[in-house]
Interface confidence: low
C-alpha cells in the first residue's frame, strides 16, 4: 500500500467518523431544540396564567379595598 | 496529478468543511444548551412568581369573603 | 483519473418517469456524499438533495420529496436519480456531484 | 429555506483587475459556503469552501470571505479564462441553497 492510499484510508476513516460525529451531533441539536421549544411553550403559557393572576390579584384587592371602605361607613352608621 | 491524489484532495476538501461544520454544530449545541438553562431559570423563577400569586390570590379572596359576610352583618343590624 | 460520468440526454412525454445514472471512476463513490443538483435553461443551481452510498441514508430538499428519488450501487461505483411525474418545469440539466467534481450533467426534456 | 442573494447579475472588468462578487445569506450560516465558476457550455467546478478555503489546483487569485451573513468572492488580477458564472451556496442547513449566480463579463 502506497503512503498515497494509506493517507486516503486514513482521511476516509477521519471522514467517516466525523460523519458519524457530526450526525450525533445534528441529532443532540434537533432534540435540544425540540426541549428548547417545548420548554418556551411552557414559559409562555406560565407568562400568561401569571397575568392572569396578576389581574386577578387587582380585581381581588380593589374589591376588598371597596368592601373595607363599605364595612368602614356602615360601622359608622353611614349606609 | 494522479485520480488517487485528487481523490486525497477531494478528500480533504470534504474533510475540512465536516469538520467545520461539526465545529459549528458543537457551538451551536453549547449555545443552545446555554440559552435552554437560561430558559428553565426563568421557568422556575415563573413558578415561583405563580405560586407566591396563588398564595396571595387565596389570601385576598378570602379577606374578600370575610369582608362581604361583615357587611352583610353590619346592613342586617344597621340598615 | 477522477472522472464521473452521467447518462446521455434524455427527451421525455410529461408523465412519465426517467432515472439517471453517474458513474464514478478514480475514486469510491461510499467514501463521498453524493449530491443531486438541478439546473433550468438560463436559471441557477438548485440542490435536490444528497445521498451515502455507503449506507443509503437520504437527506432531500423539501422541493423535491415525492419527485426525486436518489439511488446508489456502490458495485458498479453508480449514483441514480429518478424524477418521477415528469411536467415542463423538470425540463433541465442534473448533475452529480461529492461536492468537489461535478459529472458533465444530463439534460432531461420534458415535452407534452 | 435560506436564501442566498447575489444582488449583481452582471459584472463586467477588465483583465488585470480585481473584482469582487458578494452573496448574501437571509440567515446566520457561519463560514458553511462554498463558491463555484461554471464557464459557458460546462459544469460548475468548486472554487472555495468554508467561506474561505481553496480547493486544490485553484489559482490564488481566487479568495474567499465572510462569515455569518456577508460573504465575498475575490478575482484579483483577473484573466480571460475566468469569464464565467460564479454561485455561492450555503450547506449550513437544509436544503441547501444556491445563490442565483453573477456572471463575470471580460471587456
Known amino acids: 500500500v502506497t503512503g498515497t492510499q494509506e493517507a486516503q484510508e486514513g482521511l476516509q476513516g477521519q471522514l467517516g467518523a466525523l460523519r458519524r460525529e457530526r450526525d450525533q451531533l445534528e441529532t443532540q441539536t434537533r432534540d435540544l431544540e425540540a426541549a428548547y421549544n417545548n420548554l418556551l411553550r411552557d414559559k409562555s403559557a406560565l407568562e400568561e396564567e401569571k397575568r392572569q393572576l396578576e389581574q386577578e390579584n387587582e380585581d381581588l384587592a380593589r374589591r376588598l379595598e371597596s368592601s373595607s371602605e363599605e364595612v368602614t361607613r356602615l360601622r359608622r352608621g353611614q349606609c | 496529478v494522479t485520480g488517487t491524489q485528487e481523490a486525497q484532495e477531494g478528500l480533504q476538501g470534504q474533510l475540512g468543511a465536516l469538520r467545520r461544520e461539526r465545529d459549528q454544530l458543537e457551538t451551536q449545541t453549547r449555545d443552545l444548551e446555554a440559552a435552554y438553562n437560561n430558559l428553565l431559570r426563568d421557568k422556575s423563577a415563573l413558578e415561583e412568581e405563580k405560586r407566591q400569586l396563588e398564595q396571595e390570590n387565596e389570601d385576598l379572596a378570602r379577606r374578600l369573603e370575610s369582608s362581604s359576610e361583615e357587611v352583610t352583618r353590619l346592613r342586617r343590624g344597621q340598615c | 483519473e477522477v472522472q464521473l460520468q452521467q447518462s446521455g440526454a434524455e427527451l421525455m412525454r410529461s408523465g412519465a418517469s426517467v432515472k439517471l445514472s453517474c458513474t464514478a471512476s478514480g475514486f469510491n463513490i461510499k467514501d463521498y456524499y453524493m449530491h443531486w443538483v438541478k439546473q433550468r435553461p438560463e436559471q441557477g443551481l438548485e440542490w435536490i438533495g444528497w445521498i451515502d452510498p455507503e449506507n443509503g441514508d437520504t437527506e432531500y430538499a423539501p422541493k423535491f420529496q415525492g419527485k426525486a428519488t436518489m439511488t446508489a450501487d456502490t458495485s458498479s461505483n453508480t449514483a441514480y436519480l429518478q424524477l418521477s411525474s415528469l411536467t415542463s418545469e423538470d425540463t433541465a440539466v442534473y448533475y452529480c456531484?461529492?461536492?468537489?467534481?461535478w459529472g458533465q450533467g444530463t439534460l432531461v426534456t420534458v415535452s407534452a | 429555506d435560506i436564501v442566498m442573494t447575489q444582488s449583481q447579475k452582471f459584472m463586467s472588468t477588465s483583465v488585470g483587475d480585481r473584482v469582487s462578487v458578494t452573496c448574501k445569506a437571509s440567515q446566520n450560516v457561519g463560514t458553511n459556503v462554498a463558491w463555484y465558476q461554471q464557464k459557458p457550455g460546462q459544469s460548475p467546478k468548486a472554487l472555495i469552501y468554508s467561506a474561505s478555503y481553496r480547493y486544490s489546483g485553484v489559482p490564488d487569485r481566487f479568495t474567499g470571505s465572510g462569515s455569518g451573513t456577508d460573504f465575498t468572492l475575490t478575482i484579483s488580477n483577473v484573466q480571460s479564462e475566468d469569464l464565467a458564472e460564479y454561485s455561492c451556496q450555503q450547506y449550513n442547513s437544509y436544503p441547501y441553497t444556491f445563490g442565483g449566480g453573477t456572471k463575470l463579463e471580460i471587456k
Open positions: 456531484n461529492p461536492f468537489v467534481y
